[in-house]
């Protein structure tokens, strides 16, 4: 039964698919920076959200600096996985006030899932270790009120953006020492 | 059809203040985010400000943050730009400019312009 | 903040003539985010192609867009002569939102 399987083939040029990488992030930059602003004036918000379930900021842009590929990769994965599903909580509990965020809210869910998805790839085509198998994360309360909801929208979509930038800074840096 | 009208430019001094407003028609105004564009004599496009649809996301160039504010007036489709502390680099032409569709932030339809000159 | 550079500064043809405008990113900027527009002289700007490559309404289609990631281009493929103006290239991905220098493309 032939040889044993190697290690994962590493891409003949890991910088294009790191490239494909940093061009969905800074989509979804984007499309989190519009929606983010298409609720605020739909649900004007009072003062700074936010929420307890929420990842912290991976890192402040100063210390963008002493960031190694790996640790970039799996903090960014862990911390994507948890806003995915926290948008898919708001689209199933977040009430019918945010139903007027419908498509935008479904697309920026897909395509938070294929910049996930493309993340996985990178890592298995840079020959980075795979982290383990994610542990079930408890269910998400739902909202208390119909305010609530919105709170945690604007909470979940500001978080998201702050994220995505650190991500696209990281990225891009990251892509100067390959 | 889309109509964005400017005006309001004219000869100021420096450190004056200058009020623009861009009068719009053809559209459902409330529904758009709006933009300043400039454009110095000679020199090309510069991006200066954007308001969306209920004015409660602003963006601003770095060159004129703290000094110029945009502001809208849905019930009269109108939009405006308050200059204050104007520097002789802010005469240009001044555009205002509609997004192509709500929240892309686009510059789908443009005025035709009002000129600011900043001199003594 | 995005850089756009575009590419040559000046493009002197004649009618009938293939132009072939270019823009130069700073960084790698999704190709939805990239757009042209024409400006000729006294006159406001018009945007000629969205997100890369399609043509706005009542745009000609001898004009045409293409690139990605950090080079964009604009061609068009025979050129009229109210085809002479300046053309800009903008991103719209980042704030502040950014324009190219500009290319003037001049009659021969």
């Known amino acids: 039964p032939g040889p044993p399987p190697g290690p994962p083939r590493v891409s003949p040029d890991p910088r294009a698919e790191l490239d494909s990488t940093v061009l969905l992030t800074r989509s979804l930059l984007a499309d989190t920076r519009q929606l983010a602003a298409q609720l605020r004036d739909k649900f004007p918000a009072d003062g700074d959200h936010n929420l307890d379930s929420l990842p912290t900021l991976a890192m402040s842009a100063g210390a963008l600096g002493a960031l190694q590929l790996p640790g970039v990769l799996t903090r960014l994965r862990a911390d994507l996985l948890s806003y995915l599903r926290h948008v898919q909580w708001l689209r199933r509990a977040g009430g019918s006030s945010l139903k007027t965020l419908e498509p935008e809210l479904g697309t920026l869910q897909a395509r938070l899932d294929r910049l996930l998805r493309r993340l996985q790839l990178l890592m298995s085509r840079l020959a980075l270790p795979q982290p383990p198998p994610d542990p079930p994360a408890p269910p998400l309360a739902p909202p208390s009120s119909a305010w609530g909801g919105i709170r945690a929208a604007h909470a979940i979509l500001g978080g998201l953006h702050l994220t995505l930038d650190w991500a696209v800074r990281g990225l891009l840096l990251l892509k100067t020492r390959l | 059809e889309v109509q964005l009208v400017e005006s309001g430019g004219g000869l100021v001094q420096p450190g004056g203040s200058l009020r623009l407003s861009c009068a719009a028609s053809?559209?459902?105004?409330?529904?758009?985010?709006m933009h300043w564009v400039r454009q110095a004599p000679g020199k090309g496009l510069e991006w200066v400000a954007y308001?969306?649809?209920?004015?409660?996301?602003?963006y601003y160039a770095d060159t004129v943050k703290g000094r110029f504010t945009i502001s809208r007036d849905n019930a009269k489709n109108s939009l405006y730009l308050q200059m204050n502390s104007l520097r002789a680099e802010d005469t240009a032409v001044y555009y205002c400019?509609?997004?192509?569709?709500?929240?892309?932030?686009?510059?789908?339809?443009w005025g035709q312009g009002t000129l600011v000159t900043v001199s003594s | 903040e995005i850089v756009l550079t575009q590419s040559p500064a000046t493009l002197s043809l004649s009618p009938g003539e293939r132009a072939t405008l270019s823009c130069s990113v700073s960084?790698?900027?999704?190709?939805?985010?990239l757009h042209w527009y024409q400006q000729k002289p006294g006159q406001a700007p018009r945007l000629l192609i969205y997100?890369?490559?399609n043509l706005a309404s009542g745009i000609p289609a001898r004009f045409s867009g293409s690139g990605s990631g950090t080079d964009f281009t604009l061609t068009i493929s025979s050129l009229e002569p109210e085809d002479f103006a300046v053309y800009y290239c903008?991103?719209?991905?980042?704030?502040?939102?950014?324009f190219g220098q500009g290319t003037k493309l001049e009659i021969k």
């Open positions: 400019a509609r997004e192509y569709s709500s929240y892309d932030e686009g510059f789908a339809y």
């Open positions: 053809g559209f459902t105004f409330s529904s758009f985010g």
């Open positions: 308001i969306t649809p209920g004015s409660n996301t602003i």
């Open positions: 960084d790698l900027i999704p190709s939805q985010y």
């Open positions: 997100r890369t490559s």
């Open positions: 903008q991103q719209g991905v980042d704030v502040p939102f950014t």
